[in-house]
Interface confidence: low
């Protein structure tokens, strides 16, 4: 009769580092002591006629255990294969590029350490929950890669790596480990430089807007903009609408920046840069300043009129040019009554890079002179009819402007000047018309001859 030696459990599956209770038993009636052969740590727990129970501890790897016993002088054996499964100790997705250009490929790399049995371990690369690649885990550590074409929609998308240890055939289920996700940032930076709109000339201490625009940028809100006048950084306001970025700044030139300068606009995104430069000339254009030696002159005095401007500026005063650019234009006159209120005009011209810039200025002269009554406007003999309406058309002049009054000789009777009034016979007589100011008096005699009204 052939006797058997049974080993239970048969072909067990347990998690790494676990313990296993093994029972060896035989139906041989005259068996000796049952032995267990294994490289694992073992302990005899109990035994009896034809059986022995052992505890195996810290089972870390696949192993074959063998029970043996002598029965009637012959050795009989039984065996069982232990399969150990373990979850990966590390599942890590390698860092993604800090910025990834849209339309270019990038590589996802996942590294898996540990995990057994490898035949049941699969590595999955994911974008959101979308599977990009599914590959078996091979080698130790296992490294799985996938090539992905970056699109705009990947901006902000999380990528991750998942391991699946499929122990479902052994009735133990599917064990899943997932790496920490990594966020991708994608970008589009066109090859064209930004459009820079800046003035060709900029006067010292004046301000002018500078615009820098770049289209086809994604994500426009992530771009960095640097605007500068020479080495002076400008404070830019950046706006983005869709894929268009616009930076606006105000350029103000300092006196120490005079001369040929550059306006620079740099747009940086994803570690790449696009640059535009425009030439600009900073210039100083002082004046023209027109001066009078006496803003208010006395009649007969000498007045000097001068016009000056900054270096390299050609001035012309009342049509008379200065001897050379940067020099003063001057003229002298004897102040007369006719010069009162006269304006002196000065024009200034500055050449900047072949362009001529023009500016004008003027000043008005006041001449002080005594009162006068213009005989042409003030008839000395008037013949008017009684009971008619008339105006005494007399005009005085002078600086300061004189007061004009016409008083009848021998009485204090005054007739209005420049205002219509009714004439009657009592107005008949001789009048003293006097213009007076702080600079003196001027008198003119006016005779009014009033013709009595005829009743027939």
């Amino acid at each position: 009769q052939e006797f058997l030696l049974r080993v239970e459990p048969q072909n067990p599956v347990l998690s790494a580092g676990g313990s296993l209770f093994v029972n060896c038993s035989t139906d041989c009636p005259s068996s000796e002591k049952i032995a267990l052969e294994t490289s694992l740590s073992k302990e005899l727990v109990a035994s009896g006629m034809g059986w022995a129970a052992f505890n195996l501890s810290n089972v870390t790897g696949n192993s074959r255990i063998l029970c043996s016993v002598y029965c009637n002088g012959s050795q009989i054996t039984g065996s069982s294969n232990i399969t150990v499964y373990g979850l990966p100790e590390r599942v890590e997705l390698a860092p993604l590029p800090p910025w990834q250009p849209v339309g270019q490929n990038f590589t996802l790399r996942c590294q898996v350490e540990g995990g057994s049995p490898r035949t049941s371990l699969t590595v999955v690369l994911l974008r959101w929950e979308e599977e990009l690649s599914r590959q078996p885990a091979v080698e130790e550590p296992a490294e799985v890669t996938a090539t992905v074409l970056a699109s705009r929609d990947d901006h902000g998308a999380p990528f991750s790596c998942r391991t699946e240890l499929d122990m479902q055939p052994q009735g133990l289920g599917l064990f899943v480990n997932t790496s920490a996700p990594r966020q991708l940032r994608t970008f589009v930076l066109p090859v064209t430089p930004p459009r820079l709109v800046a003035p060709r000339f900029l006067e010292v201490e004046t301000s002018w807007p500078v615009d820098c625009t770049l289209d086809g940028l994604f994500p426009a809100s992530e771009a960095q903009v640097y605007l500068a006048l020479g080495d002076q950084m400008l404070n830019a306001t950046v706006m983005n609408h869709g894929d268009t970025l616009t930076a606006t700044a105000t350029a103000t030139a300092r006196a120490d920046q005079e001369g040929a300068r550059e306006i620079v606009c740099n747009v940086t995104l994803g570690g790449e840069r696009r640059e535009a430069r425009e030439n600009l000339t900073v210039f100083s254009f002082l004046g023209p300043i027109v001066n009078l030696s006496e803003p208010t002159a006395h009649e007969g005095s000498t007045v000097t009129v001068s016009c000056m401007a900054g270096a390299r500026v050609q001035v012309t005063l009342d049509g008379v040019p200065a001897a050379a650019p940067g020099q003063t234009a001057q003229l002298q006159l004897n102040a007369t009554e006719s010069d009162d209120g006269r304006s002196f005009f000065c024009s200034a011209t500055l050449e900047v890079d072949g362009e001529f810039l023009h500016r004008n200025s003027s000043v008005q002269l006041r001449v002080l002179y005594g009162p006068k009554i213009d005989r042409a406007t003030c008839p000395q003999h008037l013949k008017w009819k009684d009971k008619t309406r008339h105006v005494l058309q007399c005009q005085a002049r002078g600086n300061p402007y004189p007061e004009l009054r016409c008083l009848k000789e021998g009485s204090s009777r005054e007739v209005p000047v420049g205002i219509p009034f009714f004439v009657n016979v009592t107005h008949n007589g001789t009048y003293q018309c006097q213009a007076s100011s702080s600079r003196g008096k001027y008198t003119l005699v006016v005779v009014m001859d009033i013709e009595a009204f005829s009743s027939h």
Epitope: V102, R127, D153, H155, G156, P219, S221, E222
Partner: antibody
Framework: QVQLVQSGAEVKKPGASVKVSCKAS????????ILWVRQAPGQGLEWMGK????????TYNLKFKGRVTITADTSTSTAYMELSSLRSEDTAVYYC????????????WGQGTLVTVSS | DAVMTQTPLSLPVSLGDQASISCRSS???????????LHWYLQKPGQSPQLLIY???NRFSGVPDRFSGSGSGTDFTLKLSRVEAEDLGVYFC?????????FGGGTKLEIK
């Protein structure tokens, strides 16, 4: 379950501004994109812009010429749409919607907010 | 902008009938990544729009299989195999390949 709850109806005068809110729940706010769409009375749908709350990045419909500003507060899972320089033709129902990157479609919508612009 | 043209404007049907709506784009909706971002929405009276079909032919979760989408490039179609009362409303096609995203003018599905 995913829900987008919008603020109540508004009546505004021409030239004023309006700010509509959209509170998200039932999912991780920074995992999806929020979009704004409007519908004038008896008319079709018009896309205004979108925001990625994770980065705060926005894309706008240029038709609104800088009048629209979309923001997101991740601490309260709330998105906002502000429309300035209102005119009578801005009278519409304003919807917020969300989309995942995959699929790239608006899978959940808010209930809508009626904005009336009238002098 | 990609202009989306829907036909017909109005579609009178009897319950149980088949219905077909066409949507044409002024430019190709094939994205540089190879996907076509053409979607269909239904807006029932007094409600917000709801997603039916995404990326040309994929039914959104919970959408009955009587709805199907097809097409490529610039021409797309939404088909209903058997119209039910709950299907009535305005159908919109929409693209998200190009910014700005745009919608068709809508097709009103109504009972004859």
């Amino acid at each position: 379950q995913v829900q987008l709850v919008q603020s109540g109806a508004e009546v505004k005068k021409p030239g004023a501004s309006v700010k509509v809110s959209c509170k998200a729940s039932g999912y991780t706010f920074t995992d999806c994109i929020i979009l704004w769409v409007r519908q004038a009375p008896g008319q079709g749908l018009e896309w205004m812009g979108k925001i990625n709350p994770y980065f705060g990045t926005t894309t706008y419909n240029l038709k609104f010429k800088g009048r629209v500003t979309i923001t997101a507060d991740t601490s309260t899972s709330t998105a906002y749409m502000e429309l300035s320089s209102l005119r009578s033709e801005d009278t519409a129902v304003y919807y917020c919607a969300r989309k995942e990157a995959y699929p790239d479609a608006m899978d959940y919508w808010g209930q809508g907010t009626l904005v009336t612009v009238s002098s | 902008d990609a202009v989306m043209t829907q036909t017909p404007l109005s579609l009178p049907v009897s319950l149980g009938d088949q219905a077909s709506i066409s949507c044409r784009s002024s430019q190709s909706l094939v994205h540089s990544n190879g996907d076509t971002y053409l979607h269909w929405y239904l807006q029932k009276p007094g409600q917000s729009p709801q997603l039916l079909i995404y990326k040309v032919s994929n039914r959104f979760s919970g959408v009955p299989d009587r709805f199907s989408g097809s097409g490529s490039g610039t021409d797309f179609t939404l088909k209903l195999s058997r119209v039910e009362a709950e299907d009535l409303g305005v159908y919109f096609c929409s693209q998200s390949t190009h910014v700005p995203y745009t919608f068709g003018g809508g097709t009103k599905l109504e009972i004859k």
